[in-house]
């Protein structure tokens, strides 16, 4: 079509498409109208000087997944209505001065999955139309002052996973159009302040999986238009109070595997947006008040997996919206009877993995929609006359893993278990610790010696298992039983990433099912 | 461009499994939420489950427990569903579909994938 | 488990005129600030495409002829005037627990 070569297939479209191990050059002679080329998983090594000469109207061009370690400066002369140039999974190390140049409609370039070592500013100089420039994946150390500031078009920048250890506060002064910038997995130890105040566009900002330590104060305060802000698994020990108080847009922000010892009071600033925070896998030990009191339209609360061992009975103000609260795998002994006594929606909460001796009779007094309690592997003996009574929506309740103590005490507990055993689920049910001669007897059948009258175990509410709440990658709720999963990184562009599995696909998360959302 | 595609359509054996893929992209896969949904002859929808790609977590309607198996595979952003024990009341197209919360909409939804069920 | 009632079951409407779509949860779907209620519009052949979120937010992208309201059990889908295109299936979801969707409305052109 037009001159096809033989290793190539020609489209009726504009469209040229070479393929296969058996292309060791760029073919020829290449359709003279082609709009749209891809050179793919062939064994081309370098490009030559103007290889594409007599392609001129190319607007789309696609070299991947080659053996390319070299090119000469010229070989992309003549492409001056290109559009779209992707060089990606490559094995380049270096960028010729001048490759880009007369490259005057170039709105994308793809660089990732390289080797490259080093960019300078005179690369990306001539690109004064790009709008996406995608740099992931190779082997960058730093970036020099000016490398982007011709790129003031430029919407979306993708560092992440190279090894940049760190950044100047100068390197993205110019990209005021910026929406999208990416560092994650990288080895940066601290952002200088100052650092994004040019990006007043900017919406995703991923900063995760490097080894930040600090956050300055006003590191983000001209990003008022970020929506989503990942700096999960960092060393961040403790966040400025006013760190994160002018982001109104955010709907999403990732905190989990961090070293966050404490929160302060108001510490998420108004975030009208803000329907999940994930704050597992941390080091945070108490919960003062109103710490989460500007979230009103949070959902999902996920603390798991941190060394709570207090909550101010006001740590949940504000929480109206609150569907979801994790708690499992702390430090909690005991709980205040009202600190979830403002949490009116809630629907699932997960206690497990905790030291609680006892509960108040009226922890869940104002919690009446709740499906789904999980409190097993704690220290109970037992629990408050009527504590679920009032919980007509109550369709699981995980008891198991505590010390019993099945005296005549626990009779009115047994009784309402008895009546209410389907909520209770099969795989597990709660035992006698004490005395010696009931250990590891099932509560719901023991003889105390007191008679109790037989009776009917009605219907309950038929719910699937409980949610699942964020724990961690490497921790497996050892309690739950459930199929392997896998568990990888957050927040990555769409190739290459790990995989680490676990034995349970609730242990992140910390609870079943009976709410689906 | 967000863009979630699916499997071509399969006809099955009563009894047989099959297992339709969901690929993601345009999106960061691992930041949102994965649901299934059937959608029976001339009938409505039904929500089958969901998946989180990060921790591959899952919830299910009941109905569904023990019939569909939801998994991803993150290195090539696909969302898998799985029906076991095919029955003829199995046949319908199966959609995925993404969310950015939990409890949000279902912003984006792939073409359907059709299983067909017969003898 | 919710269940979602749509009334009508079909809705002939005349090009430029208003169509209205009622769906009533069997129990209230909202909160102070949200409702927990969705719709969809589903051409033949196509996937549910998503209107309104959270009961009167509009989807990015959809004409603003269309809009939700209501709250606790009873929700409306409004097309203040109907085009050529928008001949479809209409659903309601709810997103409170188990997620059920109502059993469609279908709007054709009178």
């Known amino acids: 079509y037009h001159g096809c070569p033989s290793e190539c297939t020609c489209s009726r479209a504009s469209q040229v498409e070479c393929t296969g191990a058996r292309i060791v050059a760029v073919p020829t002679p290449l359709p003279w109208n082609a709009m749209s080329l891809q050179i793919l998983n062939t064994h081309i090594t370098e490009l030559n000087e103007s290889p594409f000469l007599n392609i001129s109207a190319l607007i789309a061009l696609r070299i991947e997944k080659n053996e390319l370690s070299r090119i000469t400066p010229g070989a992309f002369r003549n492409l001056g209505s290109l559009r779209y140039l992707s060089l990606a999974n490559n094995k380049l190390q270096v960028l010729p001065i001048g490759l880009f140049q007369g490259l005057d409609s170039l709105e994308s370039l793809l660089l990732s999955s390289n080797q490259l070592l080093q960019i300078q500013p005179a690369h990306f100089s001539q690109c004064s139309n790009l709008k996406e420039l995608q740099l992931h994946g190779n082997h960058l150390e730093y970036i020099p002052d000016g490398a982007f500031d011709h790129l003031v078009g430029l919407t979306k920048l993708n560092l992440g996973k190279n090894s940049l250890t760190h950044i100047s506060p100068r390197v993205f002064q110019h990209l005021g159009n910026l929406q999208v910038l990416r560092l994650y997995e990288n080895r940066l130890t601290d952002i200088p302040m100052g650092t994004f105040d040019g990006l007043v566009n900017l919406q995703e900002l991923a900063l995760q999986q490097n080894q930040i330590g600090l956050l300055s104060p006003g590191l983000f305060h001209n990003n008022h238009n970020l929506q989503r802000l990942y700096l999960s698994n960092n060393h961040i020990s403790q966040l400025p109070p006013s760190v994160f108080m002018q982001l109104p847009q955010l709907n999403r922000l990732t905190l989990f595997g961090n070293s966050l010892k404490e929160l302060s009071p108001g510490i998420f600033g108004p975030m009208p947006n803000l329907r999940e925070l994930w704050l597992y896998d941390n080091h945070i030990s108490s919960l003062p008040d109103n710490v989460f009191s500007n979230l009103r339209q949070l959902q999902v609360l996920i603390l798991s997996r941190n060394q709570i061992s207090f909550i101010s009975p006001g740590a949940f103000n504000g929480l109206t919206e609150l569907r979801e609260l994790s708690l499992h795998t702390n430090a909690l002994q005991d709980l205040d009877g009202n600190v979830f006594r403002m949490l009116a929606n809630l629907q699932n909460i997960s206690l497990q993995n905790n030291r609680l001796r006892q509960l108040p009779g009226n922890i869940f007094a104002n919690v009446n929609g709740l499906m789904a309690i999980q409190l097993q592997n704690n220290q109970l003996e037992n629990l408050p006359l009527g504590i679920f009574d009032h919980l007509g929506k109550l369709c699981e309740l995980r008891l198991y893993d505590n010390p019993w103590r099945c005296d005549s005490d626990i009779l009115p507990l047994r009784n309402w278990l008895l009546l209410n055993q389907p909520r209770l689920g099969t795989d597990t049910v709660p035992v006698c610790f004490s005395p010696a001669n009931v250990r590891g007897q099932s509560l719901i059948i023991i003889n105390v010696n007191v008679a109790v009258p037989s009776v009917h175990v009605p219907e309950v509410p038929s719910y699937p298992e409980t949610p699942w709440y964020p724990d961690t990658p490497s921790y497996p709720d050892t309690t739950s039983v459930s199929s392997t999963t896998e568990l990888t990184s957050p927040v990555e562009d769409y190739t290459d990433l790990t995989t680490i599995q676990v034995t349970d696909d609730r242990s992140v998360w910390g609870m079943t099912q009976a709410q689906s959302g | 461009e967000v863009q979630l595609v699916q499997s071509g359509a399969e006809v099955k054996k009563p009894g047989s499994s099959v297992k339709v893929s969901c690929k993601a992209s345009g999106f960061t896969f691992t930041d949102y939420y994965i649901h299934w949904v059937k959608q029976a002859p001339g009938q409505g929808l039904e929500w089958i489950g969901l998946?989180?790609?990060?921790?591959?977590?899952?919830n299910y309607n009941q109905k569904f427990k023990g019939k569909a198996t939801l998994t991803v595979d993150t290195s090539t952003t696909t969302a898998y569903m799985e029906m076991s024990s095919l029955r003829s009341e199995d046949t319908a197209v199966y959609y995925c579909a993404r969310g950015d919360n939990k409890y949000d909409a279902m912003d984006y939804w792939g073409q359907g994938t059709t299983v067909t069920v017969s003898s | 488990d919710i269940v979602l009632t749509q009334s009508p079951d079909s809705l002939a409407v005349s090009l430029g005129e208003r169509a209205t779509i009622n769906c009533r949860a069997s129990?209230?779907?909202?909160?102070?600030?949200?409702?927990?209620m969705h719709w969809y519009q589903q051409k033949p052949g196509q996937p549910p495409k998503l209107l309104i979120k959270?009961?009167?937010s509009l989807e990015s992208g959809v004409p603003d002829r269309f809009s939700g309201s209501g709250s606790g059990t009873d929700f409306t889908l409004t097309i203040s005037s109907l085009q050529a295109e928008d001949v479809a299936v209409y659903y309601c979801e709810q997103s409170w627990e188990i997620r059920t969707f109502g059993g469609g409305t279908k709007v054709e052109i009178k």
């Open positions: 129990q209230s779907v909202s909160t102070s600030s949200y409702s927990y």
């Open positions: 998946v989180h790609p990060y921790i591959g977590g899952t």
């Open positions: 959270y009961a009167s």
